[in-house]
């Protein structure tokens, strides 16, 4: 089938295009090219007769067309008007006609665009700005760049007019940027020069520096004012409402107390028409003033908050000092001083940080102290304690429990029995109790300021019979001559007598034995290995008695000075040397041997077969107890004689 291919399809103005013919039939008489999608004599471009090789221009011929023998048509120096369809009409020798249509599009080389703006000096938070990319060009795509980046997504940015117009609503100072537009068509892309958006803003509230407001008589006062503003603000100073000067800085040398007052800086933007003022109160002291402490947090929460204490007033060229609890500041990673020592920061306050705190200002002659400041640290509640500590009660008595938890402000208390709320009091009182009053008694403490709650649960048993007691110990493996051991008979019961037995005997009289806590606690001071015995406690009241199981005290001791056996020190050559070392110790010690100072083996027994005089020397046994951390040793001299020279010598093992 006859087809036409346009090379290229998108043609730049001024270039050329080839309408290339594919599948041209054979045995042709001639062919003609027409502008448009059909054969129209008025729109013929050129005709070609093969027999004569004669090309004949038609009405639509422009002088820029060249026809080739293969029927392809080259159009040079393309103009915009050339866009469209082209039809090839082929006449075969049998006078049967065939047609094919091709097309191409002509695009101009785009001109360099420029940006026009409807507002060259928009005012922040008030004006909108519309940028338009010029000129308007047919079949062109428009793009925008801000600071060489594609447009950010923002509800204040809007594209319209086929993306040719970029509108910024409610401009802000951050819209001050470089804006460029780009135009594209299939054959070229162009970019404008950048336009810088000049947003008028401010003035913002001015800042007066330096920040210090307290001065000494005789100093120079040098205040500077600055307000963010475009164009830059014009400044005026007022003292106590009276205009002084139109400068950014105010300088008054050698000030006196009379220069105290309110200092106002007024910033004015002539383009936006806005004014903003800031007032600072300057105090000039004849003498250094009495300092005082300000705090950024009057009720800090323990382990949560930091507190910054600042010594006021701020005075230039002054030394600030601090005291806590009438002492100079302790070294602590939680205490931080600012560079000028004026601010003391307590990181992660605790209940012990209440103070009092004092600051001082040092002058030439003395130090002026502030009044003390006490911190009100909110803490707790800690785990509540329920008293008394009895857990067993007899029927018929009164049960009176009191709850207390360290807390600031003081905790609010609630009592629950077996999970059921009883009352919101610190004390719980039940008269004439019975077995039915046995159960889990919970005290809940709540701190309304910190919002924290803590609970403690106590099991109360009401029974005529006393339970079987048990012994608790504060040290399961005491070291001899070093540790003390406290045995406590559990549980604590009301109106109960506590008794103790050692190895089935009543307690011996000894200054190292002490009973306390109503005989409920037995303390052994400076335990010895002889205290390793069976201890039993008993409880009794008017209706019952009971004894605990025995608890044997495991006293760690030793090692004592070791003994080497046999005791012989002289041996005959050829005998076997078999030395055994023993030291009293709990737990058993580790043994090691040295001969003439040289380490040998880590065994209790040292064996050397067929000794010779070469085995003469000092034999040392070393013992160590890892549990007590103690060591000991003994040295024995061994002499080996040649056979038969020393009668009466041991023959060895």
């Amino acid at each position: 089938k006859l087809t036409i291919e346009s090379t290229p399809f998108n043609v730049a103005e001024g270039k050329e295009v080839l309408l290339l013919v594919h599948n041209l039939p054979q045995h042709l008489f001639g062919y003609s090219w027409y502008k448009g999608e059909r054969v129209d004599g008025n729109r013929q471009i050129i005709g070609y007769v093969i027999g004569t090789q004669q090309a004949t221009p038609g009405p639509a011929y422009s002088g820029r067309e060249i026809i080739y023998p293969n029927a392809s048509l080259l159009i040079q120096n393309i103009i915009q008007n050339d866009t469209g369809f082209y039809t090839l009409h082929v006449i075969k020798s049998d006078l049967v006609n065939e047609e094919a249509t091709g097309q191409f599009r002509v695009y101009p080389e785009l001109p360099k665009p420029s940006i026009s703006s409807n507002n060259s000096k928009p005012v922040e938070d008030k004006d909108a700005v519309a940028f338009t990319c010029e000129p308007e060009t047919q079949d062109a795509t428009y793009l925008w760049w801000v600071n060489n980046q594609s447009l950010p997504v923002s509800p204040r940015l809007q594209l319209s007019n086929g993306n040719r117009t970029l509108t910024l609503f409610n401009v802000t100072r951050n819209d001050t940027a470089s804006y460029k537009c780009e135009t594209q068509n299939p054959v070229s892309a162009r970019r404008s020069d950048s336009v810088i958006l000049n947003v008028l803003y401010g003035p913002d509230a001015p800042t007066i520096s330096p920040l210090n407001t307290s001065y000494r008589s005789g100093e120079n006062l040098n205040l500077s004012c600055h307000a963010a503003s475009n164009p830059p603000a014009q400044y005026s100073w007022f003292v106590n409402g009276t205009f002084q000067q139109s400068t950014q800085e105010l300088f008054i040398p050698n000030i006196t107390v009379n220069n105290s007052g309110s200092y106002t800086c007024q910033a004015h933007n002539s383009d936006t028409g806005l004014n903003r003022t800031t007032v600072t109160t300057i105090t000039v002291y004849a003498e250094p003033p009495k300092p005082f402490i300000t705090s950024n947090n009057s009720n800090p929460v323990e382990d949560e908050d930091a507190v910054a204490l600042t010594c006021e007033p701020e005075i230039q060229n002054t030394t600030y000092l601090w005291w806590v609890n009438n002492q100079s500041l302790p070294v602590s990673p939680r205490l931080q001083l600012s560079n000028d020592n004026r601010t003391l920061t307590l990181l992660s306050v605790t209940r012990n940080d209440v103070g009092p705190y004092e600051c001082g200002i040092q002058n030439e002659l003395s130090v002026d102290h502030s009044d003390p400041v006490i911190l009100n640290v909110l803490y707790g509640p800690d785990d509540p304690t329920i008293s008394p500590s009895y857990t067993y009660y007899r029927p018929g008595v009164n049960l009176s429990l009191s709850c207390h938890a360290a807390s600031n402000p003081p905790a609010q208390y609630s009592w629950l029995i077996d999970g059921n709320i009883q009352q919101h009091t610190q004390e719980l009182f039940i008269s004439n109790i019975t077995e039915k009053n046995s159960g889990l008694y919970t005290c809940q403490a709540n701190n309304s300021a910190s919002g924290h709650s803590r609970t403690t649960v106590k099991t109360i048993t009401v029974s005529a019979e006393l339970p079987k007691p048990s012994i608790s110990s504060n040290n399961s493996k005491p070291v001899e001559d070093k540790d003390a051991v406290a045995f406590t008979c559990e549980p604590e019961a009301q109106n109960t007598t506590y008794l103790w037995w050692v190895n089935g005997q009543s307690l011996p009289v000894s200054p190292r034995l002490q009973l306390s806590n109503g005989n409920r606690t037995l303390t052994l001071f400076n335990v010895t290995r002889n205290d390793a015995r069976a201890y039993v406690c008993g409880i009794q009241n008017s209706v019952s008695a009971n004894r605990s199981d025995p608890v044997t005290l495991d006293v760690l001791y030793g090692p004592d000075t070791p003994i080497i056996s046999p005791p012989d020190s002289s041996y005959l050559s050829g005998a076997n040397l078999n030395l055994s070392c023993h030291s009293a110790s709990n737990p058993s010690p580790q043994y090691s041997w040295r001969i003439n100072g040289i380490p040998q083996q880590h065994t209790q027994v040292l064996f050397i077969a067929k000794i010779t005089p070469n085995n003469n020397g000092t034999y040392a046994c070393f013992v160590s107890n890892l549990a007590t951390g103690r060591n000991n040793s003994i040295v024995k001299s061994i002499t080996v004689s040649a056979s038969g020279t020393s009668p009466g010598l041991s023959a060895g093992a």
């Epitope: 793009l143 760049w145 054959v187 892309a189």
Partner: nanobody, 123 residues
């Protein structure tokens, strides 16, 4: 102003591939549109491909369309030309060109040019 240095040229057999690079320095790379041009011995300088500032627009000469791909890496200040299915008629000195305001096939639109890198397609 921007300086351009081409590399990656060489001798390759017909049907083979090459990747040309153009390294830019001296100015913000993303401020420039870029193009590749070539000049065969005894012939006029010919447009090959162009790419705009952001890389979203490309334009190719008909003779290379479908075989060559132009791309840019603004982060590394480099322009590329991936050339596949090379033909003997692709033999030429390949130039990289830059313009702050024009991307297209017209060499007069590009004020900045590199020294070129030679591509030879031969069996």
């Amino acid at each position: 102003e921007v300086q351009l240095v081409e590399s990656g040229g060489g001798v390759v057999q017909p049907g083979g591939s090459l990747r040309l690079s153009c390294a830019a320095s001296g100015h913000t790379f993303s401020e420039y549109a870029l193009g590749w041009f070539r000049q065969a011995p005894g012939k006029e300088r010919e447009f090959v491909a162009a790419i705009n500032w952001g890389g979203g627009w490309t334009y190719y000469a008909d003779s290379v369309k479908g075989r060559f791909t132009i791309s840019r890496d603004n982060a590394h200040n480099t322009l590329y030309l991936q050339m596949n299915s090379l033909r003997p008629e692709d033999t030429a000195l390949y130039y990289c060109a830059a313009s702050s305001d024009y991307a297209g096939g017209n060499p007069t639109g590009y004020p900045y040019w590199g020294q070129g890198t030679l591509v030879t397609v031969s069996s």
